[in-house]
Interface confidence: low
């Protein structure tokens, strides 16, 4: 676990003296932007418990591994959740402290509850100031449960949570209905991912048996030791006033750790320092009790005395947790509870012992699960212990199980069982998977299903051109990362294989099956540019583009047009499958939408550089079509149009647009604006005599609407050739909009 401690100073007579300090014992913690990684962060977490805004809190960094939060001006500033984040990369860890108001209506009997998966958790809120209303329990800020006010048992409201699972973890609160949330009792529930005494994926591994109130981490099996204890199993007490994984930190102030709450990484949570208890950690342990929150009992034998910080202090000639072991009896020292080796390796196992008389090499033996006894090949004799080294024959799977180190002297004997896990190096069952390819690189997902045991510590990817006899190229990658094979040849097949390794000596597995991956054809390099575009309707856009002229054949199969609607967060892609195309009609667009438009050349599956983007605003969809359009020839150059306004208008019409086209003609139609929207007739003038014309019209509000029906009418007589149609609404002449 990460060596990270959040200290809360609970001397609450004056909020301005309250402070929180986050201390990291990690190498180089908190140095920020340099090579050591991200800094320590210490902040109030207002996501669940919100308090009235006040002046900003002051953050002060003290050296590289400590940060302190001050500037609390009133008691309500203190209530809520605080968190400290430290450690780098995958070891980044958050430590959480929950602060309750001492004057709240309800107070937690115990703030932090660490339970195992499947346990029943019981949160108990003690009535401090009674109100005769329901009590609301919340989980992570959301309503969870109601208790009637007279459901209190012995002045406490209990919330029972049977069969808890890890998702049940979080901040719980008990609040009287209609009372200030600051008067709530706040709790933190930590649910380990495994049942009692188990850890690891699938919870198959046994915890080492953490001592002195240490908690077994469900992911890595390490003991998270209470403040004031150290060692792999928390077997060793620190000197009074010290904390941290190696007892390297010192409590500030003359009264040592009095009045301080210590919060450690999950699944430990928070407690008083060793030797202290009470809601404000200001009470010394009662006689016979010791440790964090004074939760441990001494029960010293043989004249041992109880020290509230470290437990039993044994008189000369005795040792053991309760001074129950005579110094004459030999003792196995610091034996790991679990060891892991890879199949077919020949590890060395050390076993250290002390005693009077002093153990010698021949008095220490190692027994395998099948009963085979190994004798040590060498021993290191030091003043306080003898360490025997055993060379283990090549391991087989049957060697998994409980081994035993035994020491025997004339003073007696001691033995320590420990578990040996023989792991099978991983072998890929499948070939690696191709994620993306380019002309000179392949992106590969190397981590496939495998036989044998994890965790995977390294992944080696071996590759070479297909049918080649040259040496394999090898790249070593992190198990969680996809691999990019670089500097390859375009349009070339490569044979790719994976080799997996697990931690420890001999952890490399056999190579997995090969697969063929082929690099792509060359990327298109030309960048098109948009020549122009024009709106052909509220949902239609005509786009044209160009390419730079370069010698040689065009590397490309076609073009991809992309329209990005930023408002809706939607992208429209249009494929133009001819590399010779330089124009495209985009239909079915959304009227009234602001689009960002670009075009890029593609070749095989590869896209070239996109053109600089253009911004296009489509007009909004307009009103319905005008009704009952009718045309009537008035002379050899004039035709009168009459119509009725559209129905169900969404707003006032700004103008009408008339389209005039010679029937059967090949030229573009002419558009004429009728700028007096209240009119229902207009005269189109300047037409050619004896000519058949087609007319249709539409209204505009913010955008152009639907076209009306098309009507046909011929001008009269055989007059002179006119200059072109114009429009007159009643007696007024209007210009021509082409």
């Amino acid at each position: 676990a990460v060596d990270l401690t959040l200290l809360a100073n609970l001397r609450l007579t004056d909020p301005q003296r309250f402070f929180l300090t986050c201390v990291s014992g990690e190498a180089g913690a908190g140095r920020g932007s340099d090579a050591w990684g991200p800094p320590l962060l210490l902040e109030k977490d207002d996501r669940i418990v919100r308090t009235p805004p006040g002046p900003p809190l002051r953050l002060a960094r003290n050296g590289s591994h400590q940060v302190t939060l001050r500037g609390f001006s009133k008691p309500s500033d203190l209530v809520g959740v605080f968190s400290c984040v430290g450690g780098a990369g995958a070891r980044r860890t958050r430590v959480i402290y929950v602060h309750n108001s001492p004057g709240a209506h309800l107070l937690p009997d115990k703030v932090t509850h660490t339970v195992n998966k499947g346990d029943t958790a019981v949160l108990s809120a003690r009535v401090h100031k009674e109100k005769q209303t329901d009590v609301i329990w919340k989980s992570n800020g959301s309503y969870f449960y109601t208790l009637d006010w007279h459901e209190a048992q012995d002045g406490r409201f209990l919330l029972q949570l049977p069969n808890v699972q890890p998702p049940s973890s979080g901040i719980y609160s008990a609040t009287y209905l209609e009372a200030s949330p600051l008067g709530s009792a706040f709790f933190r529930l930590i649910v380990r991912g495994c049942g009692a005494g188990r850890w690891g994926p699938g919870c198959t591994k046994e915890c080492p048996g953490c001592l002195h109130g240490g908690v077994c981490h469900d992911h890595d099996g390490e003991c998270v030791c209470p403040p004031g204890f150290t060692g792999t199993r928390c077997e060793q007490a620190c000197r009074e006033g010290r904390f941290g994984q190696s007892c390297q930190e010192q409590c500030p102030g003359i009264s040592g750790c009095r009045g301080l709450t210590f919060c450690l990484p999950d699944p430990y949570g928070c407690s008083c320092g060793s030797g202290w208890r009470g809601s404000q950690c200001q009470e010394a342990c009662a006689p016979g009790h010791f440790g964090a929150d004074c939760r441990l009992q001494c029960q010293c034998q043989n004249g041992g005395t109880c020290d509230r910080f470290s437990g039993c202090v044994c008189p000369s000639g005795w040792h053991g947790v309760h001074c129950e072991k005579s110094d004459r009896i030999p003792q196995i020292l610091n034996m790991a509870s679990e060891l892991e080796f890879n199949l077919e390796t020949m590890p060395r196992i050390n076993c250290a012992a002390a005693g009077n008389p002093f153990p010698v090499r021949g008095s220490i033996e190692l027994r395998k699960p099948d009963g085979t006894v190994l004798l040590s090949t060498k021993a290191i004799v030091e003043p306080e212990k003898t360490t025997a080294e055993f060379e283990v024959p090549r391991l087989v799977l049957a060697d998994s199980g409980f081994w035993e180190c035994r020491v025997s002297t004339s003073g007696g004997q001691d033995s320590r069982r420990f578990k040996v896990n023989v792991k099978v190096p991983p072998v890929p069952l499948a070939a690696p998977r191709l994620l993306t390819k380019q002309s000179r690189q392949l992106v590969v997902s190397p981590l496939v299903s495998f036989s044998g045991d994890g965790p995977i510590s390294t992944v080696r990817l071996h590759y070479r051109p297909q049918d080649s006899t040259m040496d394999w190229s090898t790249i070593v990658v992190d198990p969680s990362e996809n691999v990019t094979l670089m500097n390859l040849r375009p349009k070339t097949g490569y044979s790719v294989r994976v080799q997996l390794s697990r931690p420890g000596e001999g952890g490399e597995g056999a190579w997995g099956p090969p697969t063929l991956m082929t690099t792509d054809c060359p990327e298109p390099l030309l960048q098109p540019w948009l020549e122009g575009w024009h709106v052909e309707g509220t949902d239609r856009l005509r786009v044209s583009w160009s390419l730079p002229l370069v010698p040689g054949p065009l590397v490309g199969d076609g073009f991809l047009l992309r329209l990005w609607d930023g408002t809706r967060g939607q992208e429209r892609r249009e494929n133009v499958s001819s590399p010779q195309a330089r124009t495209a009609l985009l239909t079915g667009l959304t009227p009234g939408t602001h689009y960002q438009l670009d075009v890029q050349l593609y070749h095989c599956t590869l896209l070239g550089p996109a053109s600089p983007p253009a911004h296009v605003l489509l007009p909004p969809s307009g009103p319905p079509a005008p009704r009952h359009l009718h045309a009537q020839a008035l002379s050899d150059s004039e035709i009168q149009l009459t119509w009725k306004h559209p129905e169900a208008l969404p707003g006032p019409i700004s103008k009408y647009v008339v389209e005039v086209q010679v029937a059967g003609g090949a030229g573009d139609p002419l558009w004429i604006d009728v700028d007096r929207p209240e009119e229902t007739s207009t005269i189109i003038r300047g037409l050619n005599a004896s000519t058949r014309y087609l007319f249709r019209m539409r209204a505009s509000i913010q955008g152009l609407g639907d076209w009306s029906n098309t009507v046909e009418e011929s001008t009269l007589g055989n007059g002179l050739q006119a200059e072109g149609p114009v429009q007159e609404s009643r007696a007024a002449e209007e210009g021509l909009d082409q």
Epitope: D134, I136, T146, D148, H150, E151, Q160
Partner: antibody, heavy 118, light 109 residues
Framework: EVQLLESGGGLVQPGGSLRLSCAAS????????MQWVRQAPGKGLEWFSS????????IYADSVKGRFTISRDNSKNTLYLQMNSLRAEDTAVYYC???????????WGQGTLVTVSS | DIQMTQSPGTLSLSPGERATLSCRAS????????LAWYQQKPGQPPRLLIY???NRATGIPGRFSGSGSGTDFTLTISRLEPEDFAVYYC?????????FGGGTKVEIK
């Protein structure tokens, strides 16, 4: 499988007394809030009493307060209802039910009929 | 106490039809979705169908669905099966005392 089985119902005269029992099995009885709910003939459901896991807290509806007493014996996995001063309007099928979290009734007994009549 | 009103009192429908039952609370209760639906057949105890306004209890078929929040809630049976003809009760459990509605009888037309 959760099972609740009521017993002790029958005919009783107004002003009389009756004690109902509810035997629980198939779950950890001592962890759950238990309650009694009744249903008059042809009528709807009426909750009237709850007891909390330790037995230290009990609640009653106004209609039965002072006349009925709910209790439990966690060692025997049994819920009880002592009914005194019975009235004609107490005639109903009496169900015991287990309260889930946060408060719906997730398991019910088959019910026992109590008839108060002279 | 919070009054729970169910409507209609009786619903006459044929098998295969859709049933929509309504439940209204006289005031909001804590949690806004702390509402359960129960089914009761003659001579049998109630059976939990829905809790949390829309979560189906264990073993309840998918044709039963709940919706609503605040004071208005609905139980919908998408296609009535012969075994669905029964009395349905709603119950709020957010505020003490926990109260039931008067019930809706779904009968064969």
């Amino acid at each position: 499988e959760v099972q609740l089985l009521e017993s002790g119902g029958g005919l009783v005269q107004p002003g009389g007394s009756l004690r109902l029992s509810c035997a629980a099995s198939g779950f950890t009885f001592s962890r759950y809030v238990m309650q009694w709910v009744r249903q008059a003939p042809g009528k709807g459901l009426e909750w009237f009493s709850s007891i909390y896991p330790s037995g230290g807290a009990t609640i009653y509806a106004d209609s039965v307060k002072g006349r009925f007493t709910i209790s439990r014996d966690n060692s025997k996995n049994t819920l009880y209802l002592q009914m005194n001063s019975l009235r004609a309007e107490d005639t109903a099928v009496y169900y015991c039910a287990r309260r889930g979290i946060p408060g719906y009734f997730d398991s019910w007994g088959q019910g026992t009929l109590v008839t108060v009549s002279s | 106490d919070i009054q729970m009103t169910q409507s209609p009192g009786t619903l006459s429908l044929s098998p295969g039809e859709r049933a929509t039952l309504s439940c209204r609370a006289s005031q909001s209760f804590v949690g806004s979705r702390n509402l359960a639906w129960y089914q009761q057949k003659p001579g049998q105890p109630p059976r939990l169908l829905i809790y949390g306004a829309f979560n189906r209890a264990t073993g309840i078929p998918g044709r039963f669905s709940g919706s609503g929040s605040g004071t208005d809630f609905t139980l919908t049976i998408s296609r009535l099966e012969p075994e669905d003809f029964a009395v349905y009760y709603c119950q709020q459990y957010g505020t003490s005392p926990r109260t039931f509605g008067g019930g809706t009888k779904v009968e064969i037309k």
